[in-house]
């Protein structure tokens, strides 16, 4: 599967829509800013082995989708843009799932994958707890939108890992 190419294209499109979703100037929400400790930004790219890159990206995409398809999310964003963003994520998820099914049996994913997956889940847990703490305020959602934009932007750094599979 030609994942690096398709993932990059879909990711660019999703990021563009996510940027358009902004409703508040970021500067007006400075007091609500939070570091959620995005795990794939703080780890060395070489740690993510090619066999674990797809499951990690899938989990990142799935958790993002869960976040933006929640009831609280639909009240926070423009419905048309939100639909478009979630559709892009759905397509990404399908691509990742297809590649993952092709990968199964080819190589046993390393145990280190468990660490990366748990780290991603903890990251999204911090985000959902933060939104709850802030009572899903418009500023809290803006902080989360900006955070997810950063996370999805960083996720393309895993693409070199995927390209290596074809070599």
């Amino acid at each position: 599967c030609d994942l690096p190419h398709t993932y990059n294209l879909r990711n660019k499109r999703a990021l563009k829509v996510l940027a358009q979703m902004r409703r508040l100037p970021f500067l007006s929400c400075l007091k609500d800013r939070q570091d959620f400790g995005f795990p794939l930004e703080k780890v060395d790219n070489q740690q993510i082995q090619k066999a674990q890159a797809i499951p990690v990206l899938r989990d990142l995409t799935q958790q993002t989708l869960n976040l933006f398809t929640s009831k609280a999310s639909s009240a926070a964003w423009n419905a048309t843009l939100l639909d478009s963003f979630c559709n892009d994520l759905h397509q990404q998820l399908n691509d990742l799932q297809t590649c993952l099914m092709q990968q199964v049996g080819v190589q046993e994913p390393p145990l280190t994958q468990e660490d990366a997956l748990l780290a991603v889940r903890k990251y999204f847990h911090r985000i959902t707890v933060y939104l709850r703490e802030k009572k899903h305020s418009p500023c809290a959602w803006e902080v989360v939108r900006a955070e997810v934009w950063r996370a999805l932007s960083s996720s393309v750094n895993l693409l070199p890992r995927l390209s290596e599979e074809k070599e």
């Epitope: 939070q34 400790g37 674990q52 390393p110 145990l111 280190t112 468990e114 707890v129 933060y130």
Partner: antibody, heavy 122, light 107 residues
Framework: EMQLMESGGGLVQPGGSLRLSCVAS????????MSWVRQAPGKGLEWVAS????????YYAPSVKGRFSISRDNSNNTLYVQMNSLGVEDTAFYYC???????????????WGQGTLVIVST | DIRVTQSPSSLSASVGDRVSISCQTS??????LNWYQQRPGKGPQLLIS???TLQSGVPSRFSGSGSGTDFILTIISLQPEDSASYYC?????????FGQGTKVEIK
């Protein structure tokens, strides 16, 4: 009894390298993230690095990133830190520490070794 | 990085006194704030995790409270063996950061 035993400390010249080891016993080593925390003599605590239970999800303090490398061998219940390009500011007691969860973040450091002293000096 | 500010840096109190140590973080860490005790010449020991959870074997005179950015460690009735340094630490995200420490002395 749960125990962590550090070794490998000693005197090293600035710019030199050192590898610290920590042998764990009394608990299921492969189920928990592990960290290194250091303390300069007479000073406070500084977290250095953490590694996930399966050897993935490695995190480093900004002061050591690019110089230190944390790793583990679950078959031998051993934690390591390879320290390169050491400077006088790295002089400290280095503690091997067990975390309460499988990967770092949203947890605590619930078991500490006695520490090994690293002195960087000419 | 999350800054952790602990106060006071030292205190002197009598046996039986109630003692409180404060810890503030530069952003919300929810409940992920831990307290450690370090006796002279020893490695630190976890006293309280997740702001208020007392660790097994730790005397009940120790208690922790707070959430978000403001936390307090309280020793209800100070004992001679409580003479030590106390550190708070945010375990919310890496890099983990510690407070500067509070040295507790017995008068």
């Amino acid at each position: 009894e749960m125990q962590l035993m550090e070794s490998g400390g000693g005197l090293v010249q600035p710019g030199g390298s050192l590898r610290l080891s920590c042998v764990a016993s009394g608990f299921t080593f492969k189920s928990f993230a592990m960290s290194w925390v250091r303390q300069a003599p007479g000073k406070g605590l500084e977290w250095v690095a953490s590694v996930g239970s399966q050897g993935g999800s490695k995190y480093y303090a900004p002061s050591v990133k690019g110089r230190f490398s944390i790793s583990r061998d679950n078959s031998n219940n051993t934690l390591y830190v390879q320290m390169n390009s050491l400077g006088v500011e790295d002089t400290a007691f280095y503690y091997c520490v067990k975390e309460t969860d499988a990967v770092a973040t949203m947890d605590a450091l619930d078991m500490w070794g006695q520490g090994t002293l690293v002195i960087v000096s000419t | 990085d999350i800054r952790v500010t602990q106060s006071p840096s030292s205190l002197s109190a009598s046996v039986g006194d109630r003692v409180s140590i404060s810890c503030q973080t530069s952003q919300s860490v929810n409940i992920y704030l831990n307290w450690y005790q370090q006796r002279p010449g020893k490695g630190p020991q976890l006293l309280i995790s997740a702001a208020s959870t007392l660790q097994s074997g730790v005397p009940s005179r120790f208690s922790g409270s707070g959430s978000g950015t403001d936390f307090i460690l309280t020793i209800i009735s100070l004992q001679p063996e409580d003479s030590a340094s106390y550190y708070c630490q945010q375990g919310y995200i890496t890099p983990y950061t510690f407070g500067q420490g509070t040295k507790v002395e017995i008068k």
